[in-house]
């Protein structure tokens, strides 16, 4: 297993609709054809897997149908979008990149993107 540098923004504020997008850029030492991207969430000292996708270079990322993540790839960067976020989902979202094929296997873990989610104010009751 060889180490690889992964860069991602330090902080992002989700939209009022609970959508957050961020880039995950990796310094690929070789010509990988198969890449796996995993998003991990760290909060309250707990780390959980949010979503993961394996893709072939030049193809779209494919997450599971029920995943809250979508993404696109371009060269050595992946643009990730997480939707359906609420204030309780605020936390550090860490991008993990694995170059699966061809060998050697490379692993890179970013410092994480702190995503803040602010629930919208409830609309005041109207008389209509």
């Amino acid at each position: 297993c060889k180490a690889m540098h992964v860069a991602q923004p330090a902080v992002v504020l989700a939209s009022s609709r609970g959508i957050a997008s961020f880039v995950c850029e990796y310094a690929s030492p070789g010509k990988a054809t198969e890449v796996r991207v995993t998003v991990l969430r760290q909060a309250d000292s707990q780390v959980t897997e949010v979503c993961a996708a394996t893709y072939m270079m030049g193809n779209e990322l494919t997450f599971l149908d029920d995943s809250i993540c979508t993404g696109t790839s371009s060269g050595n960067q992946v643009n990730l979008t997480i939707q359906g976020l609420r204030a309780m989902d605020t936390g550090l979202y860490i991008c993990k990149v694995e170059l699966m094929y061809p060998p050697p296997y490379y692993l890179g873990i970013g410092n994480g993107t702190q995503i803040y989610v602010i629930d919208p104010e409830p609309c005041p009751d109207s008389d209509f």
């Epitope: 991602q8 992002v12 504020l13 939209s15 309250d44 204030a87 605020t90 936390g91």
Partner: antibody, heavy 116, light 108 residues
Framework: QVQLVQSGAEVKKPGASVKVSCKAS????????ISWVRQAPGQGLEWMGW????????NYVKKFQGRVTMTTDTSTNTAYMELRSLRSDDTAVYYC?????????WGQGTLVTVSS | EIVLTQSPATLSLSPGERATLSCGAS???????LAWYQQKPGLAPRLLIY???SRATGIPDRFSGSGSGTDFTLTISRLEPEDFAMYYC?????????FGQGTKVEIK
């Protein structure tokens, strides 16, 4: 090294607007947030809000909503805070600061005096 | 809005003594997202502690943060002459993010 350099002191009349600038250097500007905090003479710190430079999303404290606008220009690594309809109790030092989890770097502050 | 109450308002101590500053929240602070700052007259504040207990870069280890939920503490194990200043806590676990009113640590 990380630096945030703010524009100079301003004197404004009640009802006017002020726009304070904050030029960042020494780090990847759009990877961090910029927050704005003010401090009235002899008083404590007051959070005004922040902007996520990466996507331009903002979060303003309710008391300033409709009166404040925070923006950034990523081509010049500069953040701006505009406060409108100034009142005498807006007299304060306004700080810009880099935000992630806590404010780790601060500008030197801009004194805004509102007086007729 | 989460209201932060700092106590005491003023702490009079001598160099070498231990300082204990408290910050109480009106409701639980999510993920212990609480920071402590030091401010000296005429200067911008300086981040000491974030996430309740993580020391910021370059901060001496005599500063430590602890607590969770609604009760947080900043401890200065041995006061140095340069530590006499104002101290503010700030929560960023619930919008709007708020500061406490501050504790002044003065020389006795």
């Amino acid at each position: 090294q990380v630096q945030l350099v703010q524009s100079g002191a301003e004197v404004k009349k009640p009802g006017a607007s002020v726009k304070v600038s904050c030029k960042a250097s020494g780090y990847t500007f759009n990877y961090y947030g910029i927050s704005w905090v003010r401090q009235a003479p002899g008083q404590g710190l007051e959070w005004m809000g922040w902007i996520s430079v990466y996507n331009g999303n903002t979060n303003y404290v309710k008391k300033f909503q409709g009166r404040v606008t925070m923006t950034t220009d990523t081509s010049t690594n500069t953040a701006y805070m505009e406060l409108r309809s100034l009142r005498s109790d807006d007299t304060a030092v306004y700080y810009c600061a880099r935000w992630v989890r806590g404010v780790d770097y601060w500008g030197q502050g801009t004194l805004v005096t509102v007086s007729s | 809005e989460i209201v932060l109450t700092q106590s005491p308002a003023t702490l009079s101590l001598s160099p070498g003594e231990r300082a204990t500053l408290s910050c109480g929240a009106s409701q639980s602070v999510s993920s212990n997202y609480l920071a402590w700052y030091q401010q000296k007259p005429g200067l911008a504040p300086r981040l000491l502690i974030y996430d309740a207990s993580s020391r910021a870069t370059g901060i001496p280890d005599r500063f430590s943060g602890s607590g969770s939920g609604t009760d947080f503490t900043l401890t200065i194990s041995r006061l140095e002459p340069e530590d006499f200043a104002m101290y503010y806590c700030q929560q960023y676990g619930g919008s709007p993010w708020t500061f406490g009113q501050g504790t002044k640590v003065e020389i006795k």
